[in-house]
Structure formats: C-alpha cells, structure tokens
C-alpha cells in the first residue's frame, strides 16, 4: 500500500516529475500551467547578478497521506553540489502563522530531500506556506503556498466483499480508513476473456452493482479512491485495492482441495448407496411382504384367505389380529387409464413442463477480439 517506511518514502516522491522553477514570482498549478487559483504558488528571490544565489531552488511537492502525515519532498539531485537544504513552514492568516522548522527530515543519499509533518501539524483548510532555503546562501530561498485539501491521497480501499443480489446481479462493497463521504471511487472489473478493464465511477457510497453477470466467466474487481469533490479537489488517486475474484472455476483454484472434494463426494456417494442397501435388506427381513395388487387374488385363493401363512407374521400375532366378526371378501382391480404413458404426446417436452425450478440460461462465449 501507500504507507511505506521512512527511507522508502524519501525516495518515492523524488520519482514524481519535477517542474523547472523560474526566477520570477509565478503562480503555478501542479501540472505547470499558470493559474491564479492554484494549489500553490512559488516565489524566488531575484538578484541582479547571476551567481550561486540566483540558481533556482527545486520545487517542493507535498502530499497528505490519509490526513495521517504529510511528506514534502524536493529533488536534491538537482543541486549543482550536494546541499542540505532546510525547510520552514507556517499557515497564512491563521492562528498557526508562527514559522516552524522542519523537525523530521527525509534523506536521499545522506542529503536532505524532504520533510515529514505529523497529523497534529496538518490543517487542511488553511493556506500552507512552505519555504525552502539554502543555509549557505540565506538569500537563496523559495516560498510556495499550498491548498492541502487538494493534496490528500487516501489509503487504498480495503475489505472488498462480493455478494449476489440475484441470479445475475453482483454487489461489490469496500471500506476506507477515512471519512467515507469525502471520497469518490473508481471501480474496475474484467473477466479472464477481457483484454482491458471496464471502469465505473462511484460516489461516496462505496458500493457498486454489476447488473448482468455471466455465470460461466470469472470476474476480477479492484477499487481506488480520491479525496474529491465534497471535502477537497485532489487529483491523485489512492493505490488500487487488492483485487477480489468471483466466478466459474473457484472450486478448481486449489488442486488439493479439488481432489479432496472429489474423494469426499465419491466416498460419500458409495457410503450412501451401501447404507441404502443395508436399510433395504433390513426392511426385507423385518417387514412383512406386501403383495402387489396383481397377485393378491392368487394368494388369497391359494392360502384360503390365511394371511399369516404367506405374510411371515407369527401365529400368535395373527390370532391377536383376527377380527371377532366376519367380512365379505371384496376384490379390487385397477383399470389402466386411457392415453398411454405420462409425458407422451404434444406439449410434453421438458421445456414446456411447468416446474418450480428454473433451468439456468445457456451462454455462448465469444472472444472479444
């Protein structure tokens, strides 16, 4: 993520493109365009003769990380000779307008290349003034004014979760370690068939719905956030979140688990079949044989109505079941229905039968070339 240890931090922002700084008082935007409502402006001390003191100082770039700390860095290698430049700062037209010295310098090859300010020293909505100075040439100094609310970079979104809203709709949720209403988000998603990400802007609500999901494809989602537009107008996005994956072949992800699953299913199936067979044979032994209607008449005739003789019921039990009254014998026969077997004839295809279950839709996969 974005929160590195200090030595790394000191190098991280030296890599950002640095602007050349002129001798005249200028107002610059971060991309170098002149603008009277800039996030910062820079002044240098003009002199008549060209000497060391007229060399422009490198531009200072400040970024506020999740409003936890701020790094202000400069390109120390732009100096003609290694120089430990010093940094002072204050807040314009505020209670914090006392000039402060940097108390925590960042170094690159043992030369000062930045300053880190802690949370208590950051006031987002006051104009931050930063001054870089060459201690050997006190006249050689540069001052910049910054709107810190436009320089916030949040941490990457965390805890991405996916859940199905319906058979074909997915919802992505995430968290930010910051006041959520201050951030906007960019969601990117793709399948393994896509050669490019599809992206969607999301407001402060930190949730995203994908209305149409192909069940046969695998999806990847990632999110990044920006401090914009409600609390500031930052241009820089956070790092991307860790991606989250959803889709077809998740069961094949771990070959060991896949094999284990196959074994468990096989053993379970065999166990179930054996159990059913055992139950069947046990029932065969313990339950009386129940005749089918087809041969009931023959049995009654053959055994002269003696139920216990052919059923396997003990003589004692049979006697206890004997009624103390006589009944007429009533023969029952089944008349087969007209019209043949169930499901034959028109209108009987599986597609036309009403069922409480829906068959999944068919997908035709086409390469996106």
């Amino acid at each position: 993520m974005l929160k590195p240890s200090l030595p790394f931090t000191s190098l991280l922002f030296l890599q950002l493109p640095l602007l050349g700084v002129g001798l005249n008082t200028t107002i610059l935007t971060p991309n170098g365009n002149e603008d009277t409502t800039a996030d910062f402006f820079l002044t240098t001390m003009p002199t008549d003769s060209l000497s060391v003191s007229t060399l422009p100082l490198p531009e200072v770039q400040c970024f506020v990380f999740n409003v936890e700390y701020m790094n202000c860095t400069w390109n120390s290698s732009s100096e003609p000779q290694p120089t430990n430049l010093t940094l002072h700062y204050w807040y314009k037209n505020s209670d914090n307008d006392k000039v402060q010295k940097c108390s925590h310098y960042l170094f690159s090859e043992e030369i000062t290349s930045g300053c880190q300010l802690q949370k208590k020293e950051i006031h987002l909505y006051q104009t931050f003034v930063v001054q870089l100075q060459d201690p050997r040439e006190p006249r050689r100094q540069a001052t910049q004014m910054l709107k810190l609310q436009n320089l916030v970079i949040p941490w990457a979104p965390e805890n991405l979760t996916l859940h199905k809203l319906s058979e074909s709709q997915l919802e992505l949720n995430w968290n930010n370690r910051f006041l959520n209403h201050c951030l906007e988000h960019l969601v990117q998603y793709r399948t393994d068939w896509d050669h490019s990400w599809t992206e969607q802007s999301v407001d402060y609500r930190h949730k995203f719905s994908l209305p149409s999901v192909d069940g046969q494809k695998r999806y990847t989602f990632r999110v990044r956030s920006r401090f914009n537009p409600l609390c500031g107008s930052a241009q820089h996005w956070s790092e991307w979140s860790h991606p989250i994956h959803w889709g077809s072949n998740t069961s094949k992800e771990n070959p060991f688990l896949f094999a284990l699953e196959a074994v468990v299913i096989s053993v379970g199936s065999m166990g179930l079949i054996i159990s059913l067979l055992c139950v069947y044979f046990w029932l065969e032994r313990t339950m009386p044989r129940i005749p089918t209607l087809k041969n009931l008449e023959d049995l009654v005739t053959e055994y002269h109505g003696n139920f216990s003789a052919w059923s396997g019921v003990s003589k004692g039990l049979a006697e206890s079941l004997q009624p103390d009254y006589s009944e007429r014998l009533c023969l029952v026969s089944e008349i087969p229905p007209k019209g043949g077997a169930l499901g034959e004839g028109p209108g009987a295809s599986p597609c036309n039968q009403h069922s409480p279950y829906w068959a999944p839709p068919c997908y035709t996969l086409k390469p996106e070339t």
């Epitope: 393994d192 050669h195 490019s196 990400w197 992206e199």
Partner: antibody, heavy 116, light 108 residues
C-alpha cells in the same frame, strides 16, 4: 487490417530522454486499452506500461515507475511513452500493443539504445 | 509479483510431432493465462487467451489447457511455420503483468 507503427527510438546517453509514439489504424482505438512491452534483443518479453481506454488509468512496471509516462491521444489514434532519466538497462526494442491485460496485436517495435 | 516458469527452455521436434509446452505460475492465477508465438525478427502474436480460448485466425492445431498454477500449450501436429519461441503471460495479478522466459521450438 490492424496496424501499429512505433517511432521515436534512437541512441541516447544515460540520464537522457526520449518520446516514443505509436500510430494505429484498422481498429477502433477508443475501444482498446494500450500497452508498451519491451524486449532486449535475444531475450524475453517485459511489460512496461498500460493505459486504459480513456487515458484515466495508467500502470507501470516497478523498473520504470517515476521515470516513464504513458499517454494516449484518442483523436489522433496514437499512443505515447515519455521516457526520462534513461538507464543502460532500458536498452531494448519497444513494442506497442493493443490491450491492457493481454495483447491482441503488436507493432514491430522501435529500438532504444542507452549508451555513453 | 507472480513468477511464470516455462519448461522446457528449448526443445527439438519434427514436422508432424505432437508438442507440449508447460507453464507454471508461482501462485494460482485461475485461467488468466495467455500464450504468444514469436518468430525471429517479428512481433509476438497472440495464440491463446484465458488459458484455452483460441484467438481468431489461429490454426486449430494449437490448444491450451490448465487452471490454477499449471498450464500447457499443445501443438497437435507440428507444421514448418510453427518453429518459433513461445511465451506464456499471466494477467491475473496486475500490475505487473509477467511473462515466462520463453520456450524455443527448433527443428530436429
């Protein structure tokens, strides 16, 4: 027919800069993310950078982060790679390719040589 | 970063042979695996994407399979024009996109 033609390569000293261009035709440029992939002659392929369809999202290999900038001009159907603070290890044939994640079509490449 | 390892680094085969090249990822990449062919002095050409989907215009003798960490590219009956270097590439965890070191297929 899809065509990608790179230009802008050449010999440059360490610390110098170059801007590579890739002119495209034969496909809907706006529909594709685009990438740069480099190859040291006789060696394997190394992904350098990608940009999404509208230019709003860029990704870089760690080896070039902070030194190279990818951009695109959809109106001109062109892809660019601004290379600053060049090093000897940046010497390679630079291919532009369609796609951000895998690469459907490739240009023949432009050779960048960083040497003192 | 995910490392991609191809094997073998080079192999010799004859026209008509069935050839298999394998690619192993240092962690599971699901089916986010693509294969390219590169001939000397030419740009690489996409053969297979999403592990097993044949890019349009690529002969059906090329096929890809695998999921997770182990993948194969198979050429069912080698043709003279198939002698080239083949690369696998993962697009699961990006950035960075990473390639295998390549497999050089030579005529025996």
């Amino acid at each position: 027919e899809v065509q990608l033609v790179e230009s802008g390569g050449g010999v440059v000293r360490p610390g110098g800069s170059l801007r590579l261009s890739c002119a495209t035709s034969g496909f809907t440029f706006d529909d594709y993310g685009m990438s740069w992939v480099r190859q040291v002659p006789g060696k394997g392929l190394e992904w350098v950078s990608s940009v999404n369809r509208n230019g709003g999202t860029t990704d870089y290999a760690d080896s070039v982060k902070g030194r190279f900038t990818i951009s695109r001009d959809n109106a001109k159907r062109s892809l660019f790679l601004q290379m600053n603070s060049l090093r000897a290890e940046d010497t390679a044939l630079y291919h532009c390719a369609t796609g951000e994640l895998f690469f459907d079509y490739w240009g023949q490449g432009t050779l960048v040589t960083v040497s003192s | 970063d995910i490392q991609m390892t191809q094997s073998p680094s080079s192999l010799s085969a004859s026209v008509g042979d069935r050839v298999t090249i394998t690619c192993r990822a240092s962690q599971s990449i699901s089916s986010y695996l693509n294969w390219y062919q590169q001939k000397p002095g030419k740009a690489p050409k996409l053969l297979i994407y999403a592990a097993s989907s044949l890019q349009s215009g690529v002969p059906s003798r090329f096929s890809g399979s695998g999921s997770g960490t182990d993948f194969t590219l198979t050429i069912s009956s080698l043709q003279p024009e198939d002698f080239a270097t083949y690369y696998c590439q993962q697009s699961y965890s990006t950035p960075p996109i990473t390639f295998g070191q390549g497999t050089r297929l030579e005529i025996k």
